[in-house]
C-alpha cells in the first residue's frame, strides 16, 4: 500500500479468482484513543472499533472511503483505491490502446517545434467518475523539471456504439535549449482514477522524435504566362523554431485531382516555392518536415487550382 | 537572413554539401545496423544514449546561432578553445566563434573516425561476419574533415590485445551510430545556418 496523495492510498493486488488479497491496517488520524468506530462509504454498518482497523482487501467491494468516528463526529478519512496486477502486468482498463505508432500506445505526444513544449493526449470510453493527474521530467534517475498543466477533455467522438473521449495536457520543459542534443528522454506519467480503480500510464520520448510541424502558411498560387504551370509559394509556420536557416524544413508539394483514384504528382523541395502543372479541378497541397531529422510530416495545407 | 536554404554553390560553401552527404551516410548505416542487428538492443528506445565527445568538444555551444545566444538554457558552457585556421569559409571573413565552431566539428569527426575504425577492425574478426561499417560513411567523414582543413594532432587508432566481445561491440556500434547521427544533424543545421549567414 502507498499514499497517492493526502488520505488517498493505493492497494496493489495480484488479481486472480480466489486471490488472498492484501492485509491493510488503517490508523485513525486523531489523538483520541477510545470510543472510535469505523464505517465504509455511506454505510452506517460499523466495521470495527479502536484506533486501528485491520481489513483484508480482495476486491472492489473492500475499497472505498473508510471513516473513523467518535460520538457521531467524523475524525478522519482514508480512501482506498485498487491497482490490479494481472499475471505480472498492471491493468490498463481505463485508457484505450491507440495502436499508433505501435500496439500498447496509450499516451501519444507531439511537439510543434524544439522549444521544449509538447502536448500529450489519450482516449477513454469512460465519461464519469474519472480523474487524471500528469507529471513529467527529463530523465528518471536525476530528473530535470518539466511543468505540465491540468489534463482537460479536448474532444468527444462517436465510434460505433461507443462515445470516445479525448483528454490532453500541455507540458513545458523548464529550461530547454532548442539546439540541444537530447541524451535523456522526457518521461510522462499519467495517474488515472476511475471510481475506485487506480492505473498509471507512462511514455518516454525525445522531443526530436515527436516533432510534427504545423502546416506551411500563406500558401499561394501564381499562374505563369502562356503556360499551364503555376508557381506555388508558402512560408514556414509561425510556430516553427527559429532561425529557419538553422532549423530548416523540407517540403512535399502534391497535385491531387478531384477523384482519389487519380495519380498524385509529388515534388520534394527545400525551397519555399515550386513550379507545378495545375490540372482543372485539382488542388495543390504542401506539407513540411524537419529537413535533417525525419520525424512526422505536418498536416497538408491546400489550395484549389482554380 | 532567415530564408530557407536554396541549393548551395558547392564552391562557395563546400562543407554544406559534405555535411549533407554525412547525414545521409550515417542515417543509412544506422538503418542497416537496426535491420541486421534486429535481435540486439539497437533501437533508440533500447540503447543508452552516450556522447563520446562529452567534455572533450562543445559543438552545440560553440556553433549556437546568434539568435539563440539570448536563451540562457543554451549557454551552459561557451568557453572552449580550439585551433582557428579553418578553410571552409575561405572566401569570407571567419569570425573567432565561427572558427571555434568549425574546429569543434572537426574534433568530433576525428573522434568518431577513430572509434569507427577501431570498431570495424573488431567487427572484421567476427566469425559471424554479421555487420561492418559502410566504407562510404568513413569516406564521407574523411571528406568533410578535409574540407574543414584543420591541422590537428593525429589520434592513434586504439588497439586492444584482449579478445573482442562481439555482442558488446555490436551494441556499442548501435550506441555510436545513434549518437553520431544526432551530431550529424547538428552539423548539418550549423552548415545550413553558416551558408545562409
Amino acid at each position: 500500500i502507498w499514499e497517492l496523495k493526502k488520505d488517498v492510498y493505493v492497494v496493489e493486488l495480484d488479481w486472480y479468482p480466489d486471490a488472498p488479497g492484501e492485509m491493510v491496517v488503517l490508523t485513525c488520524d486523531t489523538p483520541e484513543e477510545d470510543g472510535i468506530t469505523w464505517t465504509l462509504d455511506q454505510s452506517s454498518e460499523v466495521l470495527g472499533s479502536g484506533k486501528t482497523l485491520t481489513i483484508q482487501v480482495k476486491e472492489f467491494g473492500d475499497a472505498g472511503q473508510y471513516t473513523c468516528h467518535k460520538g457521531g463526529e467524523v475524525l478522519s478519512h482514508s480512501l482506498l483505491l485498487l491497482h490490479k496486477k494481472e499475471d505480472g502486468i498492471w491493468s490498463t482498463d481505463i485508457l484505450k490502446d491507440q495502436k499508433e505508432p505501435k500496439n500498447k500506445t496509450f499516451l501519444r505526444c507531439e511537439a510543434k517545434n524544439y522549444s521544449g513544449r509538447f502536448t500529450c493526449w489519450w482516449l477513454t470510453t469512460i465519461s464519469t467518475d474519472l480523474t487524471f493527474s500528469v507529471k513529467s521530467s527529463r530523465g528518471s534517475s536525476d530528473p530535470q523539471g518539466v511543468t505540465c498543466g491540468a489534463a482537460t477533455l479536448s474532444a468527444e467522438r462517436v465510434r460505433g456504439d461507443n462515445k470516445e473521449y479525448e483528454y490532453s495536457v500541455e507540458c513545458q520543459e523548464d529550461s530547454a535549449c532548442p539546439a540541444a542534443e537530447e541524451s535523456l528522454p522526457i518521461e510522462v506519467m499519467v495517474d488515472a482514477v476511475h471510481k475506485l480503480k487506480y492505473e498509471n500510464y507512462t511514455s518516454s520520448f525525445f522531443i526530436r522524435d515527436i516533432i510534427k510541424p504545423d502546416p506551411p502558411k500563406n500558401l499561394q498560387l501564381k499562374p505563369l504566362k502562356n503556360s499551364r504551370q503555376v508557381e506555388v509559394s508558402w512560408e514556414y509556420p509561425d510556430t516553427w523554431s527559429t532561425p529557419h536557416s538553422y532549423f530548416s524544413l523540407t517540403f512535399c508539394v502534391q497535385v491531387q485531382g478531384k477523384s482519389k483514384r487519380e495519380k498524385k504528382d509529388r515534388v520534394f523541395t527545400d525551397k519555399t516555392s515550386a513550379t507545378v502543372i495545375c490540372r482543372k479541378n485539382a488542388s495543390i497541397s504542401v506539407r513540411a518536415q524537419d529537413r535533417y531529422y525525419s520525424s512526422s510530416w505536418s498536416e497538408w495545407a491546400s489550395v484549389p487550382c482554380s | 537572413r532567415n530564408l530557407p536554404v536554396a541549393t548551395p554553390d558547392p564552391g562557395m560553401f563546400p562543407c554544406l554539401h559534405h555535411s549533407q552527404n554525412l547525414l545521409r551516410a550515417v542515417s543509412n548505416m544506422l538503418q542497416k545496423a537496426r535491420q541486421t542487428l534486429e535481435f540486439y538492443p539497437c533501437t533508440s528506445e533500447e540503447i543508452d544514449h552516450e556522447d563520446i565527445t562529452k567534455d572533450k568538444t562543445s559543438t552545440v555551444e560553440a556553433c549556437l546561432p546568434l539568435e539563440l545566444t539570448k536563451n540562457e538554457s543554451c549557454l551552459n558552457s561557451r568557453e572552449t578553445s580550439f585551433i582557428t585556421n579553418g578553410s571552409c569559409l575561405a572566401s569570407r571573413k571567419t569570425s573567432f566563434m565561427m572558427a571555434l565552431c568549425l574546429s569543434s566539428i572537426y574534433e568530433d569527426l576525428k573522434m568518431y573516425q577513430v572509434e569507427f575504425k577501431t570498431m570495424n577492425a573488431k567487427l572484421l574478426m567476427d566469425p559471424k561476419r554479421q555487420i561492418f561499417l559502410d566504407q562510404n560513411m568513413l569516406a564521407v567523414i574523411d571528406e568533410l574533415m578535409q574540407a574543414l582543413n584543420f591541422n590537428s594532432e593525429t589520434v592513434p587508432q586504439k588497439s586492444s590485445l584482449e579478445e573482442p566481445d562481439f555482442y558488446k561491440t555490436k551494441i556499442k556500434l548501435c550506441i555510436l551510430l545513434h549518437a553520431f547521427r544526432i551530431r550529424a544533424v547538428t552539423i548539418d543545421r550549423v552548415m545550413s545556418y553558416l551558408n545562409a549567414s
Epitope: D14, Y16, D18 | -
Partner: antibody, heavy 115, light 112 residues
Framework: QVQLVESGGGVVQPGRSLRLSCAAS????????MHWVRQAPGKCLEWVAF????????YYADSVKGRFTISRDNSKNTLYLQMNSLRAEDTAVYYC????????WGQGTMVTVSS | QSVLTQPPSVSGAPGQRVTISCSGS????????VKWYQQLPGTAPKLLIY???QRPSGVPDRFSGSKSGTSASLAITGLQAEDEADYYC????????????FGCGTKVTVLG
Amino acid sequence: QVQLVESGGGVVQPGRSLRLSCAASGFTFSSYGMHWVRQAPGKCLEWVAFIRYDGSNKYYADSVKGRFTISRDNSKNTLYLQMNSLRAEDTAVYYCKTHGSHDNWGQGTMVTVSS
Amino acid sequence: QSVLTQPPSVSGAPGQRVTISCSGSRSNIGSNTVKWYQQLPGTAPKLLIYYNDQRPSGVPDRFSGSKSGTSASLAITGLQAEDEADYYCQSYDRYTHPALLFGCGTKVTVLG
C-alpha cells in the same frame, strides 16, 4: 472453489458453425478476464481468444480472426466462443481459462471438424 | 511454429535432475514473466510455476523455475515416475498482450 465447465463440442462439417460455452462458478466471474485455449491432437497448446472482465475488449489469434467471436454474459457467469466457417485445422480440445498469475482451467471440450 | 522455443524431449532416471529450457526474445520473455505448466495425458494443463520462479501451494519443491534475460528454465530434481508428462512454458509479448504465447512443449520421460 473455482470451477470452469466447457460444453458444446462435437463433430461438425467444414464450413459449419458451433458455439462453445464455459460455465463459471466459485468466484466473481464479472471481475476477471477469460481466455480460450485449444490443443489439436498430439500438438502444442494454442491461444485462441481473450475477453476483458466487462466484455469491452476482445483479442484473437490470427488463425481465427474474423471467424470466431468470444463473448460473455456476466449475469449468467458464462463465457462463449462462437465458431463460424470451421476448418479441419480447428479440430482440437478447447479449454476456457481464467486470466491471472494463478489460473484455473476447465476440463476441455472436443471439437472435430470433418466431412 | 511457436515463438517460445523448447526442446522436444528430455529424459532422466528416477532421482536425477532434469532441466527444460524456454527461449524467447526481448519483447516476450525479456519483458514479461514466465509460467510453467505440467500436462498429463488426457487432462488440462496444471500450473507449476508463475512469476518466473514462484510455486503455487501444493506444487512440490522439487520443481523450480528461473529466468535470465530472454530465456527461462524449469528444473525438476529427484525425478519421479509421476513426473512423466508434457511441460509447457508460457509468456506474453509486450506488443500483443494479453495474447498467450506458449512453447510447443517438452516431453519428460522417466527412464527405467
